[in-house]
Amino acid sequence: LIIGFGISGRHSITVTTVASAGNIGEDGILSCTFEPDIKLSDIVIQWLKEGVLGLVHEFKEGKDELSEQDEMFRGRTAVFADQVIVGNASLRLKNVQLTDAGTYKCYIITSKGKGNANLEYKTGAFSMPEVNVDYNASSETLRCEAPRWFPQPTVVWASQVDQGANFSEVSNTSFELNSENVTMKVVSVLYNVTINNTYSCMIENDIAKATGDIKVTESEIKRRSHLQLLNSKAS
């Protein structure tokens, strides 16, 4: 969480941002809140990006003001206009691109004063893994697949029964570049699997950590997946 204060002759207002991550090709949110004002027409929101000389987005007098928007954000940004009056200056960023990563500033002007806060935005690709029993294999084998990751993640297998065991000798992980030549499909195979055990396939890069669990018994197979974004800090 980053909390910023204005430093003008006017009073300062508190602006709060939260570091976040965007999944390339999907829509993302850059979070920013501020002390609200009673009049929408008195609120100005400017989003800026370090190293980019045009604006990311501007909202003033109750509507978008895009004359100074940088080309790299053309047609991809929006604020939640109906929530500005209650102090929400968050930015929706459509079709997140790798180059969107960087330091953003949420700058606010209201009748009470000015304030700003920075936000670190990471971009990459992350997806839920799915673990299945590979019936085609000669021995009991598990196959963990996740369709989109970037940068290249690490894959670690774990088991409930053999806690702390190192499965690197009995697993094989491959990364296959997807058609857009950035993200990769992750496939990891675990051999010599025993029945009545829960196995976890953990995929992690500096943006996200995802886990796919599979419980294999003689009578059933249970699966569960979980994804967590890393480094979501507020400012």
Epitope: G51, L53, G54, L66, S67, D70, E71, R74, G75
Partner: antibody
Framework: QVQLVQSGAEVKKPGASVKVSCKAS????????MNWVRQAPGQGLEWMGR????????NYAQKFQGRVTLTVDTSTSTAYMELSSLRSEDTAVYYC?????????WGQGTTVTVSS | DIQMTQSPSSLSASVGDRVTITCRAS??????LNWYQQKPGKAPKLLIY???RLHSGVPSRFSGSGSGTDYTLTISSLQPEDFATYFC?????????FGQGTKLEIK
């Protein structure tokens, strides 16, 4: 007030290179992109590329890619445009122009003549 | 690249006339359309940016309108100093592209 002052006219032989300068004053040099636009005699305007003075990052028009180099010297608030492998069709007035989306201030222009 | 087609290429008019120049883009340029005036031997000067915003110091007889692909520059009452060449330019996407120009001459 904002001013962009360009270097003087140049006469070059085919195959040579030319480097034109554009000295900015009256504003913070690193706050605005610097574009380069040329105009052949009696012709229209042609955008060549732009440079981000704060990062040195560049964008070039496809037509000039590999032949034009845009640089800046932030210590003197000066932008440079170097065009190599000159041919007669490069005879034109070369302008520097400030900003993104539109060009609010222009240099006075530098005439480059390419002749054997 | 986005193609910009300006018309007419030349135009004769008298002082006091109302004049309109049009510019058509080959695709939607989301109002990122600018107009410049250029006099012989001089650099272009920005008149209007973002379709209809008057650049500082530009007389109010100049106005711009349009949306999507079609844009217009209007001079409500021509003054002697307005006889020049006018260019449109799209700033929606790189590379910037310009119309071929409209030469406004005295009738």
């Amino acid at each position: 007030q904002v001013q962009l002052v360009q270097s003087g006219a140049e006469v070059k032989k085919p195959g040579a290179s030319v480097k034109v300068s554009c000295k900015a004053s009256g504003y913070t040099f690193t706050d605005y992109y610097m574009n380069w636009v040329r105009q052949a005699p009696g012709q229209g305007l042609e955008w060549m590329g732009r440079v981000n003075p704060s990062s040195g990052g560049t964008n070039y028009a496809q037509k000039f890619q590999g032949r034009v180099t845009l640089t800046v010297d932030t210590s003197t608030s000066t932008a440079y445009m170097e065009l190599s492998s000159l041919r007669s069709e490069d005879t034109a007035v070369y302008y520097c122009a400030r900003r993104h989306n539109y060009a609010d201030f222009w240099g006075q222009g530098t005439t480059v003549t390419v002749s054997s | 690249d986005i193609q910009m087609t300006q018309s007419p290429s030349s135009l004769s008019a008298s002082v006091g006339d109302r004049v309109t120049i049009t510019c058509r883009a080959s695709q939607d340029i989301s109002n990122y359309l600018n107009w410049y005036q250029q006099k012989p031997g001089k650099a272009p000067k920005l008149l209007i940016y973002y379709t209809s915003r008057l650049h500082s110091g530009v007389p109010s007889r100049f106005s711009g309108s349009g949306s999507g692909t079609d844009y217009t520059l209007t001079i409500s009452s021509l003054q002697p100093e307005d006889f020049a060449t006018y260019f449109c330019q799209q700033g929606n996407t790189l590379p910037w592209t310009f119309g071929q120009g409209t030469k406004l001459e005295i009738k």
